[in-house]
Interface confidence: medium
């Protein structure tokens, strides 16, 4: 058995370990969320440029300095080119968020493409008629009863748009999609222990061709694949989404991870990889935009006066455009953006961020040498509530992000989508349907605390990503109640 | 249609625990979360617990946190309401419903079980 003192030994400062559990006890019994874990031990040392802790009995660092993590993420990304999750490239493990550097490198220069400005002004249509659809489910729901659970709800909205621009398909009842959410809730929030199995002895996962992710899940991409490669008879069809590009990928056969194409680094695209993507596209498409709405939403409620001011925005850019949402429009409310960015800031969806060190490495402005395959955590949800960056940080302040305010932190202060090359392929698709849908909201809406919302809300301790325990119930209002 | 049928109520001594239980049938799958309800003699029906089939998600309202636990078993259909410390505040009808995703409008009702507490 692994022994507790190689940071000791190093001379590193953390927290005294348990057995077995190393400092996840928490997180590893699912009593918390790992995100609130990683920022309590965040707090834990407000000195420290960096501490050890145990990931079971893993030895790893936390990350607590911002040049450090500028280094980590930006300045030396080529040592921590990997996340390092280490699980059987079968079972949907050769993905784009979990893929090893090669992998990434491989995938992530074909993917890039899809999220180009000219591609999201594309799929805005599509986002156009998931939200009108919306609008439309909760007009007639709000005539029976004006209190929702908006977090599940807001799933239904981001489903259809995660299906309509990446895979072409169309959800037409709110049954099919919950059907579809159903199967992919599972993967979010069935507790799987073998992420801490990997934690204890890396590389485990991989040697005995484990997967993390139930096989009904797996089941469901692969039909999903298979039907969308059917219809298309197997060819790109001049739509431009995600599956015309897995398509062409398909017609390659493989990719490369270098522009020389040396075949050491390029991956052959299987069936197998290409339901990896789907996997990946479709859960970072739907339950991070979702939750984000669902915490932004929640924030509006309880804070009137800033919700006022966004209205009297959306109705100020509307009136000036016909009454029309635009994509240009989207990105020019100021106010709204600044608040997505603030709700962001309290509720980063992905926590913690991880790397992993490709060689031995020297942590800047410290004498801390990590050795090659060394797991490196970073808290957004630590820095986002350090008062040293931000003040009163429990409170919600879409100011904070005035240019003038977001001039004055480091860089690295802020790190919802993480930072560098290997950051959130899809971040610009995220903001852009969300936004659209809070506008379509506050158009037709105002939100108001119900007396079940929840004011002390916790953070979901079964789910891998950040999320409202309970969900998320609040009252929507139509406005020409109340104007 | 989704039926609904509770049972477990009764007459219980102050301090003590007893365990609802709600099963489902029919067209299940129309529904995505169930919640338990409870109305006591003059008053309106309260929402005390709520908890979705496919991720489990629980949501528990302030005047039960600490002594009410909800849970589900997917494979009987049935879902169960455990309530704990039984004060006689707590005397009321319970009833199950179930409702669809996102909104909190239960569209579904059981006929309710009868929970006395006796000091």
């Known amino acids: 058995m692994r022994t507790f003192n190689y940071w000791k030994k190093r001379n590193v400062r953390g927290p005294e370990p348990v057995v077995f559990f190393g400092n996840l006890k928490d997180s590893a019994l699912r009593k918390k969320n790992m995100g609130v874990v990683m920022e309590e031990l965040y707090n834990m040392f407000p000195e420290e440029k960096v501490i050890g802790i145990y990931r079971m009995t893993s030895p790893c660092l936390l990350v607590r300095d911002l040049d450090v993590i500028k280094h980590i993420m930006i300045k030396d990304f080529e040592v921590f080119s990997d996340r390092g999750v280490e699980f059987s490239k079968e079972g949907l493990g050769s993905n784009l968020f979990h893929a090893d550097g090669e992998t990434w490198r491989a995938l992530g220069n074909r993917f890039t493409p899809i999220f180009t400005s000219g591609k999201l002004k594309n799929m805005f249509y599509l986002m156009h008629e998931g939200a009108d659809n919306f609008i439309d489910h909760v007009s007639a729901e709000c005539e029976k009863n004006q209190e929702f659970e908006v977090h599940s709800l807001l799933q239904t909205y981001t489903m259809s748009t995660i299906a309509a621009c990446a895979f072409g398909i169309s959800y037409d009842s709110i049954g099919d999609k919950v059907k579809a959410l159903d199967i992919v809730d599972k993967i979010i929030s069935e507790p799987s222990y073998a992420i801490e199995l990997d934690m204890m002895y890396p590389g485990l996962l991989s040697k005995l061709n484990l997967s993390i992710f139930p096989t009904v899940v797996k089941n469901f991409f692969k039909s999903l694949v298979d039907n969308i490669v059917a219809q298309r008879n197997g060819k790109p069809s001049g739509r431009n989404d995600f599956m015309d590009l897995i398509l062409e990928l398909r017609q390659l056969g493989e990719v490369t991870s270098n522009k020389y194409g040396s075949s050491a680094s390029s991956l052959e695209i299987t069936d197998e990889v290409i339901c990896a993507q789907a996997f990946v596209f479709y859960i970072a498409g739907y339950e991070t935009s979702a939750t984000t709405m669902a915490y932004m939403i929640y924030q509006l409620a309880l804070n009137p006066d800033i919700q006022n001011k966004l209205i009297a925005e959306v109705d100020e850019v509307l009136k000036a455009n016909d009454g029309k949402v635009t994509y240009d429009t989207v990105k020019e409310m100021k106010y709204l953006n600044k608040a997505f960015d603030e709700t962001l800031r309290m509720y980063s969806i992905v926590e913690p961020l991880q790397r992993k060190a490709t060689r031995d490495y020297k942590i800047p402005g410290t004498d801390v040498v990590i050795e090659k395959d060394t797991i490196v955590l970073i808290s957004p949800r630590g820095i986002h509530y350090d008062p040293k960056y931000y003040d009163n940080p429990k409170q919600f302040n879409p100011d904070r992000f005035d240019a003038e305010e977001v001039g004055k932190r480091h860089p690295c202060a802020y790190l919802p989508f993480g930072l560098g090359q290997r950051n959130c392929i899809g971040m610009r698709f995220g903001r852009l349907q969300s936004l659209l849908c809070i506008t379509k909201i506050l158009s037709k809406f105002r939100i108001e605390p119900s007396k079940n919302t929840d004011r002390n809300l916790q953070v979901e301790p079964h789910r891998g990503l950040i999320g409202p325990k309970g969900g998320i119930r609040v009252n929507a209002i139509p406005r020409k109640l109340v104007s | 249609q989704v039926q609904l049928q509770e049972s477990g109520g009764g007459l219980v001594q102050t301090g003590g625990s007893l365990r609802l239980s709600c099963a489902a049938s029919?067209?299940?799958?129309?529904?995505?979360?169930m919640g338990w309800f409870r109305q006591a003699p003059g008053k309106e029906r309260e929402l005390v617990a709520d908890?979705?089939?496919?991720?489990?998600?629980?949501y528990y309202s302030d005047s039960v946190k600490g002594r009410f636990t909800i849970s589900r078993d997917n494979a009987k259909n049935t879902v169960y309401l455990e309530i704990d410390s039984l004060k006689p505040g707590d005397t009321a009808v319970y009833y199950c419903?179930?409702?669809?995703?996102?909104?909190?409008?239960?569209?579904?009702w059981g006929q309710g079980t009868q929970v006395t507490v006796s000091s």
């Open positions: 029919g067209r299940t799958s129309r529904s995505y979360a």
């Open positions: 908890i979705a089939w496919s991720d489990g998600r629980i």
């Open positions: 419903a179930s409702r669809a995703r996102g909104t909190v409008l239960y569209n579904y």
